[in-house]
């Protein structure tokens, strides 16, 4: 590249410059001028700028800053953003397979269960769902309820078919039965500790993605102070009032400047690291019951064997209920 | 007992869990999403460098601007870089950081907090018959009568990972039957599903 | 890659508007600068003004200025540019063009151009 | 305000011969602030030179531009076919803020 010509005469080329971000020449002095009043581009000699320039140049440094760290980050900001999404939407997929899983296993094995059983496999899903999107749910409670609500429908269509329907005073009695004989042996017990694992690790998988997005999105939109936009100022512009427009900042000045300006961001550095190693260790231990894929495609067949195992001491259990809620059954047989 | 018929019904639609070679699964797709992420461990400490090197800065050219007058490239003039009498670089630095990085510095330790907790192996301690030697084996916990057998007649146990972009594209219907998962290896110690 | 792709031809009666688009895709729009030329048929290019979104300023060269009106939609990565009271001698194909910066300051090359809206 | 006179208007020359266009400011330019651009019919220019003399990416090394003041020129070496078009110079930084010859066929 030539090297830069001698300073501008009239400050002509100054204007036409300045001119571009500031339409109106009112600011840029006709020629070359003291420059007593600058504060920035403190000059050496005479100089085409003035104070109100000078403003305008700092507003521009900090905007241009602004678009550097941008497209600094634009590639790790879309590489996190792209992943929340799609394992948000991957996680949802899962979550209506194994809905659908869990209902055919009714329909196909249990058909008299089937339409009480959906609905109560559709709002224990839903409560998966909302969890994992970081809804205030307690898992226990979400299988709980799941088991509570089964059982009066297994107990009334497969254990006892001859109960007349809908009765609800039965209904609560079984519903205390179910965890007091813990009729479902340890099952409950089992899903609850793989999904509250899975969801979990799913849950807060999916908070560190986004919380990653919230790093970049301050990390791009930061406020330099004003003694950085002094310094971008000088580094990139103070050329221009001596008619200097294609010229680059040394190399190591760049660097300096910037190391001042960033000194603040560069603190997350430390945390930054730890963020990506840690979540890499809670990647690596996302198998089996810490597995969200696995866990809940995998539940409609605990579910099944829950249920075989009522079915298998169904003959114990009517004689125990039979006397624990005959109370209810009374007042249902009048 | 109940058992799994070889083809599923559901709104007269069959399950069919179809075997797909080497796509991509939710786990490997983690797993490649980390390693893109460690390539940027160093984002904020590289960053200032990267600024420069990607604005223009004199590399090929004499003559460098160093805030107060073009001089040679390599002289003293442009490594003292025109910031003496200017501002106090090390005063700009020992300002600390602002507010908003501090709040999500803040936010950050409290992540990899829970990160290290979920990750850590005594987190990971469960009853032995919950895990590796329980329900999933079909071995038996201490009180024989909830011992749990295997998963019923016929049930052939299949472990299931969900097809990942093709379960992405895939958008099933609430009530549909499960589709377009592969089938795996049968494998003994793995969490059941259907088999095709 | 930056591309700019602008509006189809139109065929304007004299004294109303036109209005031309410019979209850009690829890069940082709001820092590019984007000028607009126009060429009459079988004559030279010709300089109408142009703007940095960033700062949403406009320049118009003295011929052009209180006729042509030239905007930026930060959102849509889109300019426009829109001329008014037009004459028979506005017929020509009319170009956007990103200008090479530094530091947001247009330097005046135009190095991406559209392909013209006729 | 400046204008740019470029001469010839027309130059006719056959392939492997060398073509060396010229550009005249009315008023002192920057040489940082002359360009060069090319345009075939129905298509947009291109810009081909920059700043006096450096070329842009993707340029063939037969282009090349030189001088300063108010005298600048356009060298193409060793003419190819596809070199046929009208060749534009551009200054910025002087009332009119961009100014374009009339152009070298």
């Known amino acids: 590249q030539p090297p830069p010509p001698p300073p501008d005469a009239t400050c002509h080329q100054v204007r036409s410059f300045f001119q571009r971000l500031q339409p109106g020449l009112k600011w840029v002095p006709e020629t070359p001028v003291p420059g007593s009043d600058l504060q920035v581009c403190l000059p050496k000699g005479p100089t085409c700028c003035s104070r109100k320039m000078e403003e305008k140049y700092q507003l521009t440094a900090r905007l241009n800053m602004e678009q550097l760290l941008q497209s600094a980050s634009m590639e790790l900001k879309f590489l996190i953003i792209q992943n929340a999404a799609v394992f948000q939407e991957a996680f949802e997929i899962v979550v209506r397979h194994a809905k659908n899983y869990t209902n055919a296993m009714f329909k196909n094995n249990y058909p008299s269960l089937t339409p009480q059983a959906f609905e109560f496999v559709g709002e224990f899903f839903t409560d998966v769902s909302l969890y994992i999107l970081g809804s205030d749910i307690n898992v226990d409670d979400m299988v709980n309820e799941l088991f509570d609500s089964l059982f009066p429908v297994i107990y009334t269509q497969l254990m006892n078919p001859g109960l007349p329907d809908s009765a609800l005073d039965i209904n609560e009695c079984l519903r205390g039965a179910r965890r007091d004989l813990k009729v479902f042996g340890n099952f409950p017990k089992l899903i609850m500790t793989q999904v509250s694992k899975s969801l979990q690790v799913t849950r807060i998988f999916l908070q560190a993605l986004n919380l990653g997005i919230e790093v970049i999105n301050t990390t791009d939109h930061l406020k330099f102070s004003k003694d950085c936009g002094r310094m971008l100022t000088r580094m990139w512009y103070c050329s221009y009032c001596q008619g200097l427009m294609m010229v680059k900042p040394c190399g190591g000045y760049c660097n300096v400047v910037m190391q001042g300006c960033m000194a603040g961001v560069v603190e997350i550095d430390k945390y930054w690291r730890e963020y990506i190693l840690s979540l890499e260790e809670l990647v690596n231990g996302m198998y089996r019951i810490y597995d969200m894929e696995n866990v809940l495609l995998g539940l409609f067949s605990t579910i099944h064997d829950s249920i075989q195992y009522v079915q298998k001491n169904a003959g114990k259990l009517t004689t125990t209920i039979g006397k624990l809620c005959a109370h209810s059954q009374q007042r249902q047989y009048r | 007992s109940a058992y799994y018929p070889e083809d599923l019904f559901i709104d007269k639609k069959v399950l069919k869990v179809a075997h797909v070679e080497h796509e991509e699964t939710l786990s490997s797709r983690r797993r490649e999403l980390i390693q893109k992420l460690k390539s940027f461990i160093s984002f904020y400490s590289a960053l200032p460098g990267y600024i420069c090197s990607h604005s223009p800065v004199a590399e090929n050219d004499t003559l460098c601007w160093n805030g107060q007058e073009l001089v040679e490239r390599y002289s003293q003039k442009a490594a003292r870089n025109g910031m003496k009498n200017q501002f106090n670089l090390h005063e700009l630095k020992m300002k600390g950081p602002e507010p908003v990085v501090s709040q999500i510095i803040d936010k950050l330790k409290h992540i990899n907090q829970l990160l290290r907790t979920m990750s850590m192996p005594k987190g990971r301690v469960l009853d032995k018959n919950l895990d590796e030697e329980g329900f999933e084996s079909g071995d038996c916990g201490d009180d024989e009568d909830e011992c749990i057998g295997g998963s019923g007649d016929g049930m052939i146990k299949v472990k299931n990972q969900l097809r990942f972009l093709a379960e992405l594209a895939y958008d099933l219907d609430v009530d549909d039957a499960p589709g377009n998962s592969q089938q795996a290896t049968p494998k003994d110690n793995e969490i059941s599903t259907f088999h095709n | 890659e930056v591309q700019l792709v602008q509006s189809g031809a139109e065929v304007k009666k004299p004294g109303s508007s036109v209005k031309v688009s410019c979209k850009a895709s690829?890069?940082?729009?709001?820092?590019?600068?984007i000028s607009w030329v126009r060429q009459a048929p079988g004559q030279g290019l010709e300089w109408m003004g142009g703007?940095?979104?960033?700062?949403?300023?406009?320049n118009y060269a003295q011929k052009f200025q209180g006729r042509v009106t030239i905007t930026a939609d930060k959102s849509t990565s889109t300019a426009y540019m829109e001329l008014s009271s037009l004459r028979s001698e506005d017929t020509a194909v009319y170009y956007c063009?990103?200008?090479?910066?530094?530091?947001?300051?247009?330097?005046?090359?135009?190095?991406?151009w559209g392909k013209g809206t006729t | 305000e400046t204008t740019l006179t470029q001469s010839p208007g027309t130059l006719s020359l056959s392939p492997g011969e060398r073509a060396t266009l010229s550009c005249r400011a009315s008023h002192s330019v920057s040489s940082n602030f002359l360009a060069w651009y090319q345009q075939k019919p129905g298509q947009a220019p291109r810009l081909l030179i920059y700043a006096a003399s450096s070329r842009t990416t993707g340029v063939p090394d037969r282009f090349s531009g030189s001088g300063s003041g108010t005298d600048f020129t356009l060298t193409i070496s060793r003419l190819e076919p596809e070199d046929s078009a009208v060749y534009y110079c551009q200054q910025y930084g002087y009332s009119p803020l961009y100014t374009f010859g009339q152009g070298t066929k």
């Open positions: 690829g890069g940082t729009f709001s820092s590019y600068a």
């Open positions: 063009a990103r200008e090479w910066q530094q530091q947001l300051v247009p330097l005046g090359y135009m190095d991406v």
């Open positions: 703007i940095i979104p960033i700062f949403g300023t406009a």
